[in-house]
């Protein structure tokens, strides 16, 4: 799996999970979230050569096609596979609210 | 939806469905498929600016972050959403076989 256990420990230019910290105020301009200040969102990046973690039959076809026709820019792309939620604390007036924001943290990647 | 109805009728640099014909022998080196000779596989390509057909909360976060830090290459990517199968005819010896290959045709796209 193209997850932290593999990607963070290896030199990998191909599609893999990359660490990324997001600060809500600084990076997104979101001032409404009280806690946490930011979080490890991660992201997916890297090349998708033939058979590198292909998600579907179409992505396998596309990566094979791309080896023959690289100028077509018709290659698969490295995107998130498994995502996890993030629990946040915010206020409505003076009332604290705890909420789970779905699909906020990328845990693994795929070529799609 | 970023499908043929929208994408093939509009000039769209952002993420959208693009037409692509794949010839099995010429483009993939697959000689085992008897019919069809090729098919309209299509593919997804284009930029994923903030809120352009974002698939998840993470892709929305990432596209917003990317406007501030484009050099990070941490932007969402344009990938397939809906896929359809393709029916093919091939031979085992002299026996014809009809099979449905799943997820071979891209029908719409998303930013993920």
């Amino acid at each position: 799996a193209l997850d932290a256990a593999y990607c963070f420990r290896n030199v990998q230019d191909n599609c893999c999970l990359r660490p990324l910290y997001i600060d809500f105020k600084r990076d997104l301009g979101w001032k409404w979230i009280h806690e946490p200040k930011g979080y490890n969102a991660n992201f997916c990046a890297g090349a998708c050569p033939y058979l590198w973690s292909s998600d579907t039959q179409h992505s396998r076809v596309l990566s094979l096609y791309n080896t023959i026709n690289p100028e077509a820019s018709a290659s698969p792309c490295c995107v998130s596979q498994d995502l996890e939620p993030l629990t946040i604390l915010y206020y409505i007036g003076k009332t604290p609210k705890i909420e789970q924001l779905s699909n906020m943290i990328v845990k693994s990647c795929k070529c799609s | 939806a970023l499908d043929a109805a929208y994408c093939f009728r509009n000039v769209q640099d952002n993420c959208c469905l693009r037409p692509l014909y794949i010839d099995f022998k010429r483009d993939l080196g697959w000689k085992w498929i008897h019919e069809p000779k090729g098919y309209n596989a299509n593919f997804c390509a284009g930029a994923c600016p903030y809120l352009w057909s974002s698939d998840t909360q993470h892709s929305r976060v990432l596209s917003l972050y990317n406007t501030i830090n484009p050099e990070a290459s941490a932007s969402p990517c344009c990938v397939s959403q809906d896929l359809e199968p393709l029916t093919i005819l091939y031979y085992i010896g002299k026996t014809p076989k009809i099979e449905q290959l799943s997820n071979m045709i891209v029908k719409s796209c998303k930013c993920s």
């Epitope: 963070f8 660490p19 910290y21 600060d23 105020k25 600084r26 890297g46 | 990070a72 290459s73 941490a74």
Partner: antibody, heavy 119, light 107 residues
């Protein structure tokens, strides 16, 4: 163990180009970002620029026209190139790592290399 | 760019005493501040990040706090190994900038 080590010439002449190499171990350049920071003798630190885990770069606008940062992930090396060197560029040059990309503080530093610009 | 102003330039303290170092940001940096310790001939060492988070391996006598645009590094009881130069750094906006440093010397 995480280590970074700078190497390159200790003396360069004015108008020449400086090339410094930062060799890292204990972590991957496809996972972490690497920054360059310099410090003139007895003075404050100055952030110069960084190279992302994905290969993108960002430079201090005051130095942007003279700086190039690149890397060779297979060799675990980051290279700083600075053109048109001047005596005011005499400083100790450090490479450093941020603990998580986009955290923007530096948890591991190289020992630094003193570069003197003089004719 | 964001200007970081440290005070005092030099702080004379006896071992065992408390030291308080200040760093003022020219604009709001939303707690995105780090503190480093540097000894002669050595590279900086990260002590505090996010204004108040203690870096792994750093003694608990070091602490960070903030009040508006002013950020403070406190060393509760100075040890002999703490005499050094301390720099603050904002990690809020490009270009990341450092203060000019505070030298903590033996009184």
């Amino acid at each position: 163990e995480v280590t970074l080590k700078e190497s390159g010439p200790v003396l360069v002449k004015p108008t020449e180009t400086l090339t410094l190499t930062c060799t890292v171990s204990g972590f991957s350049l496809t996972t972490y970002n690497v920054h360059w920071v310099r410090q003139p003798p007895g003075k404050a630190l100055e952030w110069m620029g960084l190279i992302w885990n994905t290969g993108g770069t960002r430079y201090n606008s005051a130095l942007k026209s003279r700086l190039t940062i690149s890397k060779d992930t297979s060799k675990s090396q980051v290279v700083l190139t600075m053109t048109n060197m001047d005596p005011v560029d005499t400083a100790t040059y450090y490479c450093a790592r941020d603990p998580v990309p986009n955290k923007w503080h530096f948890d591991f530093w190289g020992p630094g290399t003193l570069v003197t610009v003089s004719s | 760019e964001i200007v970081m102003t440290q005070s005092p330039a030099t702080l004379s303290v006896s071992p065992g005493e408390r030291a308080t170092l200040s760093c003022l940001a020219s604009e709001d940096i939303y707690s995105n501040l780090a503190w480093y310790q540097q000894k002669p001939g050595q590279s900086p060492r990260l002590l505090i990040y996010d204004a108040r988070s203690l870096q792994d391996g750093v003694p608990a006598r070091f602490s960070g706090s903030e009040s508006g645009p002013e950020y403070t590094l406190t060393i509760s009881s100075l040890q002999s190994e703490d005499f050094a130069v301390y720099f603050c750094q904002q990690h809020h906006a490009y270009p990341f900038t450092f203060g000019q440093g505070t030298k903590v010397e033996i009184k």
